[in-house]
Interface confidence: low
């Protein structure tokens, strides 16, 4: 009863020309030990012969004969539990289905594993949190659906083309559940990082470039403001006029409201980027700043100290 065969392995394995593929695999045949194992490439069932046709990459029969010339293909398993395979190096034309033809005393089974070999190293994939806010620590993740014992790789993080100083943690998985290499970087972005390009670069053991993925940082932040005053020294006499201008150097998302504050108190009906004070009086001396808000929160400019002297 072929329903007794239970296999566990990654569904699809990914590699590129010249690299290798390590296929973690376990199986169970309840009626006893394996007597014959054949690894096919793209097997097809032949109804006339009741056998499978296809390239035989590896063959192991009960009398121990291993006629395979494919030294690059290794069966690292055993007769009752392990069906792990290694192909090193792996070639473009290895893409397709690997068929594990297993036979025990009374049962037969064909297990299929998909192999996807690309011509060049495929890029990793950067995963960002759904939202990034300034000064809040986030974890950047770079994931590559590849890991192989015979082909060491590394993932490096770059910001605007320059290696990032923060320490990244790299982990690999070579299990029946999943095969991947992952790099995680904890990072506290500043507002000035908004719009900057982050790269995760795949390199070989010698640091040679293989591929990369890039993302543009979208750092949510309160409006960043500059205040300008005329006259520039903010010292005037009673009766003079003063103009203060608020400039938004950056805001993400877009700003929604503008207000002016004097000594921390909002000035009524002053909701434009220019504050005009005409014929100032002594009691208008004080600390002025502009406040611009967006969905993240309010941003304030530096304070300007206005000194109104007697005429």
């Amino acid at each position: 009863d072929s329903s007794k065969w239970v296999f566990e392995h990654p569904e699809t394995l990914y590699a590129w020309e010249g690299a290798c593929v390590w296929i973690p695999c376990t199986y169970r045949a309840l009626d006893g030990d394996l007597e014959s194992f054949i690894l096919f490439h793209n097997p097809e069932y032949n109804k006339n012969t009741s056998k499978f046709d296809g390239t035989r990459l590896y063959e192991s029969t009960k009398d121990g004969k291993v006629p395979s010339e494919q030294k690059r293909v290794q069966f690292l398993g055993d007769k009752n539990k392990n069906c792990t395979l290694s192909i090193h190096p792996v070639h473009l034309n290895d893409s397709g289905q690997l068929g594990l033809r297993m036979e025990s005393k009374t049962e037969k089974w064909m297990e299929r594993i998909h192999l996807n070999v690309s011509e060049r190293p495929f890029p990793p994939h950067i995963q960002l949190p759904p939202e990034i806010q300034e000064s809040q620590e986030v974890t950047l993740t770079c994931l590559l659906n590849f890991s192989c014992y015979g082909y060491p790789i590394q993932l490096q993080w770059l910001l605007e083309g320059v290696p990032m100083r923060q320490a990244a943690v790299t982990s690999t998985s070579l299990t029946i559940k999943s095969v991947f290499t992952r790099s995680e970087l904890k990072f506290s972005p500043q507002w000035s990082h908004h719009g900057k390009i982050v790269t995760c670069q795949l390199q070989d053991a010698d640091g040679k470039f293989l591929s990369n993925d890039t993302v543009q940082l979208n750092v949510k932040h309160t409006p960043k403001l500059e205040i300008k005053v005329t006259p520039s020294d903010a010292i005037v006499r009673e009766g003079d006029s003063v103009t203060m201008t608020c400039e938004v150097s950056s805001s993400n998302p877009e700003y929604t409201t503008v207000s002016w504050l004097k000594d921390g108190t909002s000035l009524k009906k002053q909701n434009t980027f220019t504050l005009n004070l005409r014929e100032v009086t002594k009691d208008q001396s004080g600390k002025y700043c502009c406040q611009v808000s967006n969905d993240v929160g309010p941003g304030r400019s530096e304070e300007v100290f206005l000194q109104v002297q007697y005429a």
Epitope: F7, P10, E11, T12, Y45, F52, M110, H114, K177, S178
Partner: antibody
């Protein structure tokens, strides 16, 4: 264009047998799992079983094992559902559905369905 | 067998409404490969079902972007962001991770 066309439905007496056919065209028949799904009148969908035509490998839902048999003929690009010892509760529309990818498992193409009525 | 329970069984909604259908499995439907083979199908009266979403959240080709899927483990959701006249139908979740494969009982989306 990928197409599945079922046939063989009709009226059958309780205890009788019926063989449904699902003719496939527009793709490599032997390399995709073919599923049978049924739907009793006014009820939901129920998975019956599947076959991989390339090697004849099958899986069934437990309640259909023994009475229903799925087979395939790659020379005719046709899958079959042989139903024996039919009961009134087997009255349903029977659909064949292709697994679009042996690696993603989803039913991307369905036949139009064929109605089986079990009644005396 | 894994039971797939959908809620609600039926709902009435208007064109433009946001509709959410949930599907709960009686046990985890994570496949040994690490994938979760959870699909959503749409069926109209007298017609064969049509695939909308596969592997929890992947939209099948040609399916409008107003359909989205989410979830993990045992809890899954199909969302229609803005219901259109052609969306009134019955929706089924389906697990293809463990044998026997099983469908939910269906959710009928009717015009209010």
């Amino acid at each position: 264009e990928v197409q599945l066309v079922e046939s063989g439905g009709g009226l059958v007496q309780p205890g009788g047998s019926l063989r449904l056919s699902c003719a496939a065209s527009g793709y490599e028949f032997s390399r995709s799992w073919m599923n049978w799904v049924r739907q009793a009148p006014g009820k939901g969908l129920e998975w019956v079983g599947r076959i991989y035509p390339g090697d004849g490998d099958t899986n069934y839902s437990g309640k259909f094992k023994g009475r229903f048999t799925i087979s395939a003929d790659t020379s005719k690009n046709t899958a079959y559902l042989q139903m024996n010892s039919l009961r009134a509760e087997d009255t349903a529309v029977y659909y064949c559905a292709r697994d679009g990818s042996s690696w993603d498992w989803y039913f991307d193409v369905w036949g139009q369905g064929t109605l089986v009525t079990v009644s005396s | 067998d894994i039971q797939m329970t959908q809620s609600p069984s039926s709902l009435s909604a208007s064109v433009g409404d946001r509709v959410t259908i949930t599907c709960r499995s009686s046990q985890s439907i994570v496949h040994s490969s690490g994938n979760t083979f959870l699909e959503w199908y749409q069926q109209k009266p007298g017609k064969a079902p049509k695939l909308l979403i596969y592997k929890v959240s992947n939209r099948f080709s040609g399916v409008p972007s107003r359909f989205s899927g989410s979830g993990s483990g045992t809890d899954f959701t199909l969302t229609i962001s803005s219901l259109q006249p052609e969306d009134f139908a019955t929706y089924y979740c389906f697990q293809g991770s463990q044998f026997p494969y099983t469908f939910g009982q269906g959710t009928k989306v009717e015009i209010k």
